[in-house]
């Protein structure tokens, strides 16, 4: 028998690589049974993940999985940084992993950069 | 069920390109990590790297980074790795494999491998 | 990178004995999300490596429960409590926590 328990399906240490000035949508997906969840996203500052309040969200419908969606309108490069998205489930919290966003500035790119690149420049995220 | 299936040229010339593909079946890639990784004759595995084909992000070996290149086909349900500047180092049998999802993240499907020479 | 260290380099034992191979990572492999992805692997000659064990101690499916996986941090373990003809194979250890993935250098078992 298949779980009825919520699950938020962000891939463990995924990235994304983006550029400053464009629309982007950072998806969580988010596997349920019956009720949705109330889902919110946060910004992870450090070890502490601070709530994103204000934003722009949607959800999108699929067959077998729903996504909430966290919309950039667009990409700044304080957007730079890693983001959780999260459940509330029977009173309980659940978690996903966190995904990175690495902004380029496009003002400050030259030419733009390979998506290992960016991911093998993590203090990136610090700047 | 899950298949993953490496294929390519078993002969390589040396200072040439290295070419596989690895055709998957029973899953979609865009679900998941497809990784490389080689073992020279009577030798240890050597992870080569892997991408994430949802978006093309790639993480490579420090070791072999200057040299190889993981792309994806999402509407093949396939992956590619070249690599670049070969030497009779790099003969090897290549894998693909799966990194499953939540909750494990962990390599749980292998393709056969394919043995790849280089040699003149 | 972290280096993942595998002992023995081989082992030789009779049937029904039990055989112990140790991983030692060069740092810990506890990830920020609580788990630890270690992983044990077992290979077979002219065979791709099958997973046997995954986070640290979870037996995949079909895999005997004479395996066992323990440990923390950076030590880690697996057991096989009665060694059968069928477990000749390399075993390595393998981390999935910090990039770039490494193996261990792979421990040989063998029958006496």
């Known amino acids: 028998k298949e779980s009825c328990d919520v699950q938020l399906y962000i891939k463990r240490q995924s990235y994304h690589s983006i550029f400053a000035g464009d629309p982007f949508k950072l998806e969580c997906p988010v596997k349920y049974c019956a009720h949705r969840p109330q889902v919110t996203w946060c910004k992870l500052n450090g070890t502490t993940c601070v709530k994103l309040e204000g934003r722009h969200t949607s959800w999108k419908q699929e067959k077998n999985l729903s996504f909430f969606i966290l919309h950039f309108e667009p990409v700044l490069p304080s957007d730079n940084g890693s983001y959780r998205c999260s459940a509330n489930f029977l009173s309980a919290i659940i978690e996903s992993h966190s995904t990175t966003l690495y902004v380029t500035d496009v003002k400050s790119a030259s030419e733009r950069p390979s998506k290992d690149e960016m991911a093998s420049r993590p203090w990136l995220l610090y700047s | 069920q899950v298949q993953l299936q490496e294929s390519g040229p078993g002969l390589v010339k040396p200072s040439g390109t290295l070419s596989l593909t690895c055709a998957d079946s029973?899953?979609?890639?865009?679900?998941?990590?497809i990784h490389w990784v080689r073992q020279p004759p009577g030798k240890g595995l050597e992870w080569i790297g892997r991408?994430?084909?949802?978006?093309?992000?790639?993480r490579y070996n420090p070791s072999l980074k200057s040299r190889v290149t993981i792309s994806s086909d999402k509407s093949k349900n396939q992956a590619s790795l070249k690599l670049s500047s070969v030497t009779a180092a790099d003969t090897a049998v290549y894998y693909c494999a799966r990194e499953d999802g939540y909750p494990y993240y962990t390599l749980d499907a292998w393709g056969q491998g394919t043995t790849v020479t280089v040699s003149s | 990178d972290i280096v993942m260290t595998q002992s023995p380099d081989s082992l030789a034992l009779s049937l029904g004995e039990r055989a112990t191979i140790n991983c030692k990572s060069s740092q810990s492999l506890l990830d920020v999300d609580g788990k630890t992805y270690l992983n044990w692997f077992q290979q077979k000659p002219g065979q791709p490596p099958k997973r046997l064990i995954y986070l640290v101690s979870k037996l995949d499916s079909g895999v005997p429960d004479r395996f066992s996986g323990s440990g923390s941090g950076t030590d880690f373990t697996l057991t096989i409590s009665s060694v059968q003809a069928e477990d000749v194979a390399v075993y390595y250890c393998?981390?999935?926590?910090?990039?770039?993935?490494?193996f261990g250098q792979g421990t040989k078992l063998e029958i006496k």
């Open positions: 029973g899953f979609s890639i865009s679900d998941t990590y």
């Open positions: 991408i994430d084909p949802a978006n093309g992000f790639t």
């Open positions: 393998w981390q999935g926590t910090h990039f770039p993935r490494t």
